[in-house]
């Protein structure tokens, strides 16, 4: 059957009907409903929200909605023994203590169960010692400290500013440098945009505001105690000592009022350059230790958090496909929040809710999608993408055989300037075509397409007249689907102007001040950006689930493969002598990319010309498209990262949030000049080139004519 036979309405009518049904007012109402109390993972509040969503999705018309639970390792502060940091004098007396909680915003003073700021999965401990300021605690910051400035962090407590990279990478770097503890703080340079007031008068971070967050280095493992397998009742669990990705030193986050008190006394070396200085009225000395008058004072951390196996709950809704019920298009976003979740995640969850309602409305009118759509409300994303990963582990065999695409739906907004899309190259054309059909919500672009405003505000660095689409990294629930299982994935949200707003995330990220009012007053009063994001996410799901031929263009993969091969070759060519000495050649990789390009081109011609009314041929061609992403998976995974299996993309080893291309080769080349055994190091580069070459060639062959 064709799509129109299955649904009794033409596909175009369906898409229009679906988009027209999405309403900004509903998203606003849902957001308000989801943000009145905290929904921390592992709490009754979040379980009740799961049951509410289950009930409402059933009312909206989904065929089935189930709760799936897993028992995973979570981390919480000790309720009777709070975490804090002190400055202690030579007698050991605490002469300054950091705050125990964030002052709650107006109207929320009587709300219980606001978890105080903490770094999830920090071990317990009370280290004391001299402080070293390590800038953003990036790899390059520690290189600067250790190699250029000859400053040793061993035995020291380091203080790092949030921003630029995932906090777990900061902690890993500090551990490797020998630090005994880590203090994370939000510097106004990164979390206070000039000319904007602090919350509640604006969207900036007040001095008492603190960013919560996990500090794991899971590398895609999911629950730290059950890597590779679902954390169900009969799962074998590792001991805590063998758990994946846990930090080994105490970590705690603070706001800039408290940071001021620690940093103002810093002595030792001056900061190396202006890139190390934030906006506080402090010298930004690196240390170690405090300046002259205060040199006998030390810093002491008091961390008493505990990690415990806790039950979490996903909500999984199904809208069965009429023609290909065994092909799954998944729309998923998380439900758990650190506190109120005004942006993260509920601005996304509210959009998912409205998308479900719209699909349900069509279904009640007799329509069904061609393929099955699965909707997911994930739990425990904030604790390491746990809900999505455990569900994918439990359903991996189904997903790798049936998974067409995964669309992520965390925060719908991180600004209100323009669209931001990260996706597989297979989806580029889908996104371009869809955004050309949608109306821009931007001021000054009335009557213009979203594509036009997006292209103007965020142009592609390579192709004029086209918008930027970024690589997928991690730090969100698409990770297991894309990086581990090789299911084509994408995400879209509204973002800030990266040219003028250089701070790292939105200022109130993961703080108590991330409320409904923040969104309604400052980011999107008309909820027009939320509506646009709903149209983009929902439109992508609609097309992926309902197009007769999957809306994937393999030629776009060919283009990026060439670009990535050029890029990694240029990195390697910074060492021409070694390449010559160790006979390192990229010829095979460029040859495989050329083959891929040619085969993709021929496949696209066949795709254009084949008889779409032949169901066997149609299914065959669609399967080749669906399985192309899967073909980039190496079952052995990347070195020391077995759950990152995609050969073309992986989260950067230096910043989980960022995507890296040809990550195996990239990591083999990284800092290669400092390796003690160059022969072995360049041998590993050659091994990684061969893996990449094989993978690209093998992927190309999946697109060849079958017989």
């Amino acid at each position: 059957k064709s799509s129109s036979e299955a649904t009794n309405i033409t596909p175009k009518h369906n898409m229009k009907a679906f988009l027209d049904e999405l309403k900004a007012e509903n998203i606003k109402k849902f957001l308000h409903n989801f943000t009145q109390i905290p929904h921390l993972a592992g709490t009754e509040q979040n379980f009740q929200l799961a049951k509410q969503i289950q009930s409402q999705w059933k009312e909206f018309g989904l065929d089935s909605v189930e709760l799936t639970h897993y028992d995973v390792l979570l981390s919480y502060p000790n309720k009777t023994h709070p975490n804090y940091i002190s400055i202690i004098n030579e007698d050991g007396n605490e002469i300054f203590n950091t705050s125990l909680f964030e002052p709650p915003p107006a109207g929320y003073e009587n709300v219980s169960d606001i978890v105080p700021p903490f770094s999830a999965f920090s071990p317990q401990g009370m280290p004391e010692g001299d402080l070293v300021y390590v800038n953003y605690a990036r790899t390059e910051d520690f290189f600067k400290l250790e190699r250029d400035m000859k400053i040793n962090c061993s035995g020291k407590i380091v203080i790092a500013r949030y921003g630029k990279v995932f906090r777990g990478n900061k902690v890993k770097n500090a551990q490797l440098a020998g630090a005994t503890g880590v203090i994370l703080y939000s510097d106004p340079a990164d979390y206070f945009a000039p000319g904007v007031k602090s919350y509640p008068d604006g969207w900036n971070l007040p001095g008492g505001g603190v960013q919560r967050g996990n500090i794991l280095n899971l590398n895609g493992a999911g629950d730290p105690l059950t890597p590779g397998y679902p954390a169900n009742e009969y799962a074998y669990r590792r001991g805590i000592a063998e758990a994946v990705g846990l930090p080994s030193i105490p970590v705690h986050p603070i706001g800039y009022y408290d940071a001021q008190k620690l940093l103002e006394k810093m002595g030792g070396s001056a900061s190396p350059d202006s890139s190390w200085r934030g906006s506080l009225k402090v010298p930004y000395n690196v240390g170690p230790g405090f300046t002259g008058n205060f040199s006998t004072q030390k810093v002491k951390m008091h961390i008493h958090s505990t990690s415990e196996v806790t039950r979490i709950y996903n909500v999984i809704g199904t809208l069965r496909g009429a023609v290909e019920p065994d092909r799954y298009v998944i729309l998923g976003g998380h439900r758990d929040s650190w506190v109120f979740g005004g942006i993260d995640p509920q601005s996304g969850a509210a959009v998912v809710h409205e998308i479900v309602r719209s699909f349900g409305t069509l279904k009640k009118e007799g329509w069904r999608p061609r393929r099955t759509i699965l909707f997911a409300s994930w739990d425990a994303e904030e604790f390491g993408l746990l809900g999505s990963t455990e569900w994918a582990e439990e359903n991996s065999r189904l997903l790798q055989e049936r998974g067409v695409a995964y669309i992520n739906a965390d925060s719908s907004i991180e600004g209100n300037y323009t669209l931001r899309v990260d996706c597989t190259p297979l989806m580029y054309s889908l996104v371009y075509n869809l955004t050309k059909e949608l109306e821009s919500p931007d001021e000054g672009f009335e009557g213009k397409s979203l594509y036009e405003s997006w292209t103007k505000k965020s142009p592609s660095p390579e192709f004029s007249g086209m918008p930027r689409i970024s690589k997928l990294g991690s730090g969100n629930d698409f990770e297991v689907f894309f990086q581990r299982l090789g299911i084509a994935s994408g995400r879209a949200r509204y973002t800030k102007n990266w040219e003028t707003n250089k701070f790292s995330s939105y200022p109130l990220y993961h703080s108590v001040y991330e409320t409904y009012e923040l969104v309604e007053k400052f980011y999107d009063p008309m909820f027009k950006y939320h509506l646009t994001v709903a149209q983009v996410r929902g439109g992508m799901v609609f097309e992926l689930a309902n197009s007769v031929v999957l809306p994937f263009d393999c030629r776009d993969y060919a283009v990026v493969l060439r670009k990535y091969a050029d890029k990694i070759y240029n990195i390697s060519m910074k060492h021409p002598q070694e390449m010559k000495t160790y006979s390192v050649s990229f010829d095979s990789l460029f040859s495989a990319v050329k083959n891929f390009t040619e085969i993709a081109s021929k496949f696209s011609e066949r795709l254009r010309d084949f008889d779409k009314s032949n169901p066997i041929l149609l299914r065959m061609m669609n399967d080749q498209l669906m399985f192309l992403e899967r073909a980039f998976i190496d079952p052995l995974g990347l070195p020391d990262r077995p759950f990152y299996r995609h050969v073309i993309y992986a989260p950067s080893s230096h910043n989980k949030y960022a995507g890296e291309s040809f990550p195996g080769i990239y990591d083999a080349l990284f800092d290669i000049e400092s390796k003690v055994d160059p022969s072995q190091a360049w041998g590993e580069v050659k091994r990684q080139i061969s893996i990449a070459t094989f993978t690209v060639q093998a992927a190309a062959e999946t697109l060849s004519e079958v017989a």
Epitope: I37, P38, L40, G42, T43, E44, Q45, N46, F47, H69, D71, L74, Y76, K79, T80, N110, V111, S112, D113, V115, E233, E308, V309, T310, R311
Partner: antibody, heavy 121, light 107 residues
């Protein structure tokens, strides 16, 4: 529907022990804990302690530590409270109540019908 | 331990009347307070959780509120089945403690 069915009334001698049961149905037993509450005739309510069957963790009101022992059997979805070294002060109605197993919860939502314990020589 | 002082200990009121029962907490308990109803046969039912959230199936004439350390259960229009015992429960910190109870009697 959620139900907590408690065992029948107990008559015991001073110094003896009794073991009360609370059989749960209508929900996933391991997603919740069971709290126990004491009510003496014409008196108010006192929290004794709680057990979380999934984890096996128990938490007691210090006042009842040594007096009450809480256990649970996941296979039969039942919770138990043993009261030992009984005195007349232990004569009361004892309630079990369901409590969510999580870092934050809303305390006791569903209650058993109560078990009367009479200690008399 | 946190003391919960409930008042009044008994209250006579008429059908259709609006009544309020109060519990005062000796320490900060945030919104971690429930209201329970006990029937003459001993059956206990939760009416309100987290200070002001109504349990499912509980009539909307029941409501909960807070003012500082005082927590109130209000019945907007008394019906015959409401003339029973009521208790507050704080669950902010262990050991969890109950108010002394209010016996609501028909005038």
């Amino acid at each position: 529907q959620v139900q907590l069915q408690q065992s029948g009334a107990e008559l015991a001698r001073p110094g003896a022990s009794v073991k009360l049961s609370c059989k749960a149905s209508g929900y996933t037993f391991t997603s919740y804990g069971i709290s126990w509450v004491k009510q003496r005739t014409g008196q108010g309510l006192e929290w004794i302690g709680e057990i979380f069957p999934r984890r096996g963790n128990t938490y007691y009101n210090e006042k009842f530590r040594g007096k009450a022992t809480l256990t649970a059997d996941k296979s039969s979805s039942a919770a138990y409270m043993e009261l030992r070294s009984l005195t007349s002060e232990d004569s009361a109605v004892y309630f079990c109540a369901r409590v969510f197993d999580g870092y934050y919860n809303y305390a006791m939502d569903y209650w058993g019908q109560g078990t009367s314990v009479t200690v008399s020589s | 331990d946190i003391q919960m002082t409930q008042s009044p200990s008994s209250l006579s009121a008429s059908l259709g009347e609006r009544v309020s029962l109060t519990c005062r907490a000796s320490q900060d308990i945030g919104s971690s307070l429930n209201w329970l109803q006990q029937q003459p046969d001993g059956t206990i039912k939760r009416l309100i959780y987290a200070t002001s959230s109504l349990d499912s199936g509980v009539p909307t004439r029941f409501s909960g509120s807070r003012s500082g350390s005082d927590y109130s259960l209000t019945i907007s229009s008394l019906e015959s089945e409401d003339f029973v015992d009521y208790y507050c429960l704080q669950y902010a910190s262990s050991p969890y403690t109950f108010g002394g109870g209010t016996k609501l009697e028909i005038k």
